[in-house]
């Protein structure tokens, strides 16, 4: 009983429960393939508890192993649209610091209009995650179709 | 050592480890797009620890941020079946209380026969999640092809 | 403060935080549909904390409910390749002990080149998970395209 009370009195951050779920804000200018994200209760069901946004990109505040997940749906898309504009590819990676730059997750749309995946990966405080959408199709901004999040799992 | 013992002696519910994994029971009558779920060890590998089923829909018992995941495969499906009957769409949302009704996750099948995705979302005690499959194709009832679950992540 | 310190001093294993993320090592000989996995920091971003590899297959060390996730991308693939070589199917299951053999997760590629999914499932110490790729196409060995992991969620 005492432990449960103690647990509730501790700030959640000390338990390492960093978590974020983001919605699409906008795409970058033409030569910038990055998606720009936003989050916060005022925007709907998106939130940041621990991680932060830095110019629309997600920055990690706590070392650990994270579950990274993403879903991106192409706007006004049919399977013929998707195949005609192939290749449209989404990649999630660490984009800064440059010394840690790496692609974590990559998917192509082929004849589909939605990609969704998730993976476990070690991330360090200060890592910034970028999501690059290459191709000429726009992502849907509907919050139930396009979203991106991380969940701290363990040290 | 003492902490580990204390943790094991506490009921898991006090740690907020609510979790459920469900298998498809049946589809609704023709004008009802909802999928009806079932869970419990007698049924195989499905279970409910915390959340409950209310007429085949999942009801949340603990406030918090949850990871919601789903996979639905269309029955005896080939890519030609799937494309012929576009649009077949799956949406997961809060369907009650009505004041909190919202779509959380939406995917179309396009030329595919399976959709799978997951997202983090805040849910409150009493929220009921519905999974709506629109279109005229049936979901597979195989337990390794169609399933739906939630996992409490943090307060 | 004392609790947070105590938590950090405890071995993570006593908290039940078993987790693994694997990258593809190789496929089996022609009559063996299993994918063979590898993990460890020397290999990149893959790791095993608790579970172990047994001849390229993942063996569970702690009873509990796990989140199992996988992504497999077919090598040098286009939607025409995928549909021409249909059916290409991925199944994740318990392959030993034989008494607990069961398929947990199954997806077909149809006209796509990537499958990705996840599910919650109870696993027991000693369960070995196998990932069977049936068909004549090879999986990509790129670490951001093909990966497999588990995360302990609760007892």
């Amino acid at each position: 009983q005492r432990f449960a009370q103690a647990q509730q009195q501790l700030p959640l951050e000390s338990l390492g429960w960093d978590v974020a779920e983001l919605q699409l804000n906008h795409t970058g200018p033409q030569q910038d393939p990055r998606l720009y994200w936003q989050g916060g209760p005022a925007l709907g069901r998106s939130f940041l508890h621990g991680p932060e946004l830095d110019k629309g990109q997600l920055r990690i505040h706590r070392d650990g192993i994270y579950m990274v997940h993403i879903q991106v749906t192409l706007a006004i898309c049919s399977s013929t649209t998707a195949s005609r504009h192939h290749p449209t590819t989404l990649a999630v990676g660490i984009c800064s610091p440059a010394s840690r730059s790496i692609s974590l997750l990559r998917l192509s749309f082929h004849q589909g209009c939605t990609i969704a995946s998730q993976r476990l990966t070690p991330l360090a405080r200060g890592d910034t995650l970028c999501t690059n959408l290459t191709g000429t199709l726009l992502p849907s901004r509907n919050t139930d179709e396009t979203f991106f999040g991380v969940q701290w799992v363990r040290p | 050592q003492r902490f580990a013992q204390a943790q094991q002696q506490l009921p898991l519910e006090s740690l907020g480890w609510d979790v459920a994994e469900l298998q498809l029971n049946h589809t609704g009558p023709q004008q009802d797009p909802r999928l009806y779920w079932q869970g419990g060890p007698a049924l195989g590998r499905s279970f409910l620890h915390g959340p409950e089923l209310d007429k085949g829909q999942l009801r949340i018992h603990r406030d918090g941020i949850y990871m919601v995941h789903i996979q639905v495969t269309l029955a005896i499906c080939s890519s030609t079946t799937a494309s012929r009957h576009h649009p077949t769409t799956l949406a997961v949302g809060i369907c009650s209380p009505a004041s909190r009704s919202i779509s959380l996750l939406r995917l179309s099948f396009h030329q595919g026969c399976t959709i799978a995705s997951q997202r983090l979302t805040p849910l409150a005690r009493g929220d009921t999640l519905c999974t709506n499959l629109t279109g005229t194709l049936l979901p597979s009832r195989n337990t390794d092809e169609t399933f739906f679950g939630v996992q409490w992540v943090r307060p | 403060q004392r609790f947070a310190q105590a938590q950090q001093q405890l071995p993570l294993e006593s908290l039940g935080w078993d987790v693994a993320e694997l990258q593809l090592n190789h496929t089996g000989p022609q009559q063996d549909p299993r994918l063979y996995w590898q993990g460890g920091p020397a290999l990149g971003r893959s790791f095993l904390h608790g579970p172990e590899l047994d001849k390229g297959q993942l063996r569970i060390h702690r009873d509990g409910i796990y989140m199992v996730h996988i992504q497999v991308t077919l090598a040098i693939c286009s939607s025409t390749t995928a549909s021409r070589h249909h059916p290409t199917t991925l199944a994740v299951g318990i392959c030993s002990p034989a008494s607990r053999s069961i398929s947990l997760l199954r997806l077909s590629f149809h006209q796509g080149c990537t499958i990705a999914s996840q599910r919650l499932t109870p696993l027991a110490r000693g369960d070995t998970l196998c990932t069977n790729l049936t068909g004549t196409l090879l999986p990509s060995r790129n670490t951001d395209e093909t990966f497999f992991g588990v995360q302990w969620v609760r007892p």
Epitope: - | A75, C77, R84, G135, T136, L138, S140 | -
Partner: antibody, heavy 120, light 111 residues
Framework: EVQLQQSGPELVKPGASVKMSCKAS????????IHWVKQKPGQGLEWIGY????????KYNEKFKGKATLTSDKSSSTAYMELSSLTSEDSAVYYC?????????????WGQGTLVTVSA | DIVLTQSPASLAVSLGQRATISCRAS??????????IHWYQQKPRQAPKLLIY???NLESGVPARFSGSGSGTDFTLNIHPVEEEDAATYYC?????????FGGGTKLEIK
């Protein structure tokens, strides 16, 4: 009310062709696959093939490839089947049928049938 | 192609009694957690009429005295209690794969 109205009986000579129609009403024509089924006098039922009027997607029973051609006219909500190089084996009642609510090959609504008689 | 074999080819049942018609498939017609077998009734000079779909689901408007059962390869249509208007030929049909095929039919006569 869903109705499938088929064209009248046909008496045709061996080697000739025949084109029969199936006019749909009571629903959106392009939403449902139309199947065709053959029944020889006093015998059982044989599936010929289907046509989806939405995109003219067709599938044929191997046995009827080269024998039957399925088409449709969206403007008049009518499906057609043409049978070519007719022989006495083609003498039968031909039904058009519509699937049920679910998009699989079972048949909830049927036309009244078109009798084709092949005779010199 | 999947072959469906019906038995008996014909049967006579007294009014109010039970009629049982069997249908055997040459291979399993179960898939994706469903049994892809359907039953039709055909009266002379009429089109077939759907009675049962997916082995056991009663089509809208069909009397509850009709019921279907079975899984895998062996299926049964039951009519109980049989009424005068049930005199007809009954067909099973599968839709497990293309092409769908029909059984040879069972002619029901009311005694």
């Amino acid at each position: 009310e869903v109705q499938l109205q088929q064209s009248g009986p046909e008496l045709v000579k061996p080697g000739a062709s025949v084109k029969m129609s199936c006019k749909a009403s009571g629903y959106t024509f392009t939403d449902y696959v139309i199947h065709w089924v053959k029944q020889k006098p006093g015998q059982g039922l044989e599936w010929i093939g289907y046509l989806h009027p939405y995109n003219d997607d067709t599938k044929y029973n191997e046995k009827f490839k080269g024998k039957a051609t399925l088409t449709s006219d969206k403007s008049s909500s009518t499906a057609y089947m043409e049978l070519s190089s007719l022989t006495s084996e083609d003498s039968a009642v031909y039904y058009c049928a519509r699937r049920g609510y679910y998009d699989y090959a079972w048949f909830a609504d049927w036309g009244q049938g078109t009798l084709v008689t092949v005779s010199a | 192609d999947i072959v469906l074999t019906q038995s008996p080819a014909s049967l006579a049942v007294s009014l109010g009694q039970r009629a049982t018609i069997s249908c055997r498939a040459s291979k399993s017609v179960s898939a994706s957690g469903y049994t892809w077998i359907h039953w039709y009734q055909q009266k002379p000079r009429q089109a077939p009429k759907l009675l049962i779909y997916l082995a056991s689901n009663l089509e809208s408007g069909v009397p509850a005295r009709f019921s279907g059962s079975g899984s895998g390869t062996d299926f049964t249509l039951n009519i109980h209690p049989v009424e005068e208007e049930d005199a007809a030929t009954y067909y099973c049909q599968h839709s497990r794969e293309l092409p769908p095929t029909f059984g040879g039919g069972t002619k029901l006569e009311i005694k």
